[in-house]
Every structure is written in C-alpha cells, then in structure tokens.
Interface confidence: medium
Amino acid sequence: MEIPMSTVVKETLIQLSTHRALLTSNETMRLPVPTHKNHQLCIGEIFQGLDILKNQTVRGGTVEILFQNLSLIKKYIDGQKEKCGEERRKTRHFLDYLQEFLGVMSTEWAMEV
Amino acid sequence: MEIPMSTVVKETLIQLSTHRALLTSNETMRLPVPTHKNHQLCIGEIFQGLDILKNQTVRGGTVEILFQNLSLIKKYIDGQKEKCGEERRKTRHFLDYLQEFLGVMSTEWAMEV
C-alpha cells in the first residue's frame, strides 16, 4: 500500500528534527538559502541544496530514511509539475485556474503590503 | 511611487472579473489547465496560457491594464525566482528553510490525505 504524501511530509519533518545534529556536523558547508519566504518558487534550489547535503553527510542508519523520504517528496513534486500542462481546456476553465492562483498569491504569499 | 505587488494582485483579480466576457469570447481556444490545485508548481504554464490568451484577445481599452498588471506579476515572480539561489548560508539556515517549506507543504498544499 502506498503511503499518502501528507504522511510522508509529516514524517520527514519529525526526522529532520531528529537528525539535526548530524546534518549540521559540517560547519563549513554553504548551501543556497532563498532570501524570501515564497518557498514554492525555490523548489529547484531546495533540492539542489539537499543533494549537496546528502553527499556531505555520513550515511547509514535512520538518516537514510530521511533522505529516502525527501527523494519521495521530490518525485511527488516532479509528478505534479508534469500535470501542469497535461490538459487543454476552454478559456473559462483557464481563467478559473488563474483566478485561483491569484487568490492564493494574494492570501498566502509573502509579499510587501 | 511603486505600487505594492499585493495591490497589483488584488486589482488584477477585480479586472479579471470585469473582463471575463471579453476574455472568453473565443469559444474554440484551448489553454493548458493543470489537473491539481498546487498552482505554485504551474507558474510557467499559467503565463504560457496567458500569452496565448493575450494574442487572441481584441486589444485596447481597459483590458490593456489587465495584461499590463499580469506582466508586472510575472516580472515580480521572475525576480523572486532569481533570489532563490542568491545567498549561500550555513547548513542550519538551509535546514530552517527546508523545515518551513515542508511545513507549508504539509498545511497549505492540496495533497491526498
């Protein structure tokens, strides 16, 4: 049975806490950190940073599950991205989607007022 | 004086409603509409669809302001994207950003439970 993605994300948050000391054991490493809170625009950089971190982290044990989960999350996001242009629909459907996007942007994005 | 982006987005939402009839006058046009509600992953496709719509819409009058605003929003998003990899910081700052991203994903994204 496939684990729901919402569960994977919640588990990953817990694992991140658990492995914080291990993940920060290399104090000299520098990773890309966006300068704003619109995380959704920076997914590429987040996973690029994770690849660097993975390669620099002592492997084995339960930290492997953390990296496996992060890999599942990336796979899920890539799958969602593929669905972006999958369907061609009437203009009114497109406008509904645009309206929703702007609504989300208006209420949930970190923008200067 | 530069208009805050939050104001531009709110205005654009109003203009979209106002010009709905004009924008949907071409019944044969088909545009890319994502099959999920994680709009933030589909920004490329949204603005690609807008380019098609712009080229197919009778220009002039107040609809011009709508397209100008949508162009400003695209410019803002592109600017935000550029800031994604602008800074290189300590692992702990990167982990905080990752933690926040997963937190947002967990609470705000449309995922199967």
Epitope: S17, T18, A21, T24, S25 | Q99
Partner: antibody, heavy 119, light 107 residues
C-alpha cells in the same frame, strides 16, 4: 520530561580550572546541540560556545577560545564546560542550554552553577 | 561580532499596562532573534524565537515583531508574574550575542 541538571557551586582560586557538568535526560542526547552561557553578578548574559554531541564538534566565542573547553560523555548523556586560568572576573553563574531541534532557539536551560573565583 | 542594543535598560509599569521593549542589531540577522525572560535567582526562559514565533506554553500576551535589524517585544497587558529582566539574543551568526537586558519593575 526534558531536563538539564547541572553540578553544584564551586569556589576556585585565581589561575585554577573549573569543570561544570550538565546531565541531560528525557531526550536523545546526540540529537541536540548544548550551549553554554554565563552571567556575572548583576550583569547580562554572555554566550561561551556550543557543542554538537553527535560528533563532538564545538564552536567557541573568541573571547573564551583557548580557555574554555566543551566536551561530552555520550555514555552518561553529560556535557562539560571547563574553564582554565580563572580570574576574578570569571565569577558568574554558568548555564547550559539545549538547542531545540527546529530553528535553534534555547528551549531548555539548566538551573545554573555558581562559580566563585577568589583568593 | 554582532552588537545587540536593547532599550530601555529599565522601565516601571503597572499591572495591565502595555509594555514595549526594542532591540537593534548592528547588522541584518535574518529574523534569527529570540526573547528571553529571567526572574531574579532563576534560570532564563525563552519566550519567542525567530523574531515573532511564540513558544508553546508562553501566554499570548507576549508577542514579537520585526526583521532585519529592528525588533520589538510587546507585553499587551502586564501581569504580576511578568516583572523580570528581558533579553534579546541573536543566533544568526557566531558568536551568539545578547542585548544588555531590560528590567521591568513595578511602578
């Protein structure tokens, strides 16, 4: 519950060394950094440094580098702060504090250890 | 080192008063700021982290705001148990540095 219990008060002579302990319980010791902070009588707080119990990596405030040594004993879940070449201005209460797993703030503090340096 | 300048150094207030304490960093600290409360003879206690995030169990009358270099701690309605010294702490860069403290006394 999560607790940090520190060793008792110490009186030392100038030039001597002191080693303060901080015993952790109620959580996985290697998962959280331990910070050390001191407070001279009637003064504010001053950060000495931190140690990552996972790999014994420590980071010091330059002011204490060479005089402060942070160590851990994983088998007893205990962190130690040793301060050498003591002088009267080192008279202070020394606190250990745990970094919370997310976002680095100090979520649990020890009760403090008073170190008095006097001839 | 990053300097943290807190003001005022002390203030007198009455129960029910709204109290504001400010903290200025000598450089941008990316919201890596916490507010710490200390009562006489007791260990410090963290109230707020990341500039505005209230820690579980801390009363909602405490709130934090600010980003970059300027930060504020507000107690909306001062209670008898709030009379203490408050410190800001930056943990954006090493060495972590504290403000000099603000003593909140009973008027």
């Amino acid at each position: 519950q999560v607790q940090l219990v520190q060793s008792g008060a110490e009186v030392k002579k100038p030039g001597a060394s002191v080693k303060v302990s901080c015993k952790a319980s109620g959580y996985t010791f290697t998962n959280h950094h331990i910070n050390w902070v001191r407070q001279a009588p009637g003064q504010g707080l001053e950060w000495i440094g931190y140690i990552n119990p996972y790999n014994d990596y420590s980071r010091y405030n330059q002011k204490f580098k060479g005089r402060a040594t942070l160590t851990v004993d994983k088998s007893t879940s205990t962190a130690y702060m040793e301060l050498s070449s003591l002088r009267s201005e080192d008279t202070a209460v020394y606190y250990c504090a745990r970094d919370y797993g997310n976002f680095w703030y100090f979520d649990v503090w020890g009760q403090g250890t008073l170190v008095t340096v006097s001839s | 080192d990053i300097q943290m300048t807190q003001s005022p150094s002390s203030l007198s207030a009455s129960v029910g008063d709204r109290v504001t304490i400010t903290c200025k960093a000598s450089q941008d600290i990316n919201s890596y700021l916490s507010w710490i409360q200390q009562k006489p003879g007791k260990a410090p206690k963290t109230l707020i982290h990341r500039a505005d995030r209230l820690i579980d169990g801390v009363p909602s009358r405490f709130s934090g705001s600010g980003s970059g270099q300027d930060f504020t701690l507000t107690i909306s309605s001062l209670q008898p148990e709030d009379f203490a010294t408050y410190y800001c702490l930056q943990y954006d860069d090493f060495p972590y540095t504290f403000g000099q403290g603000t003593k909140v006394e009973i008027k």
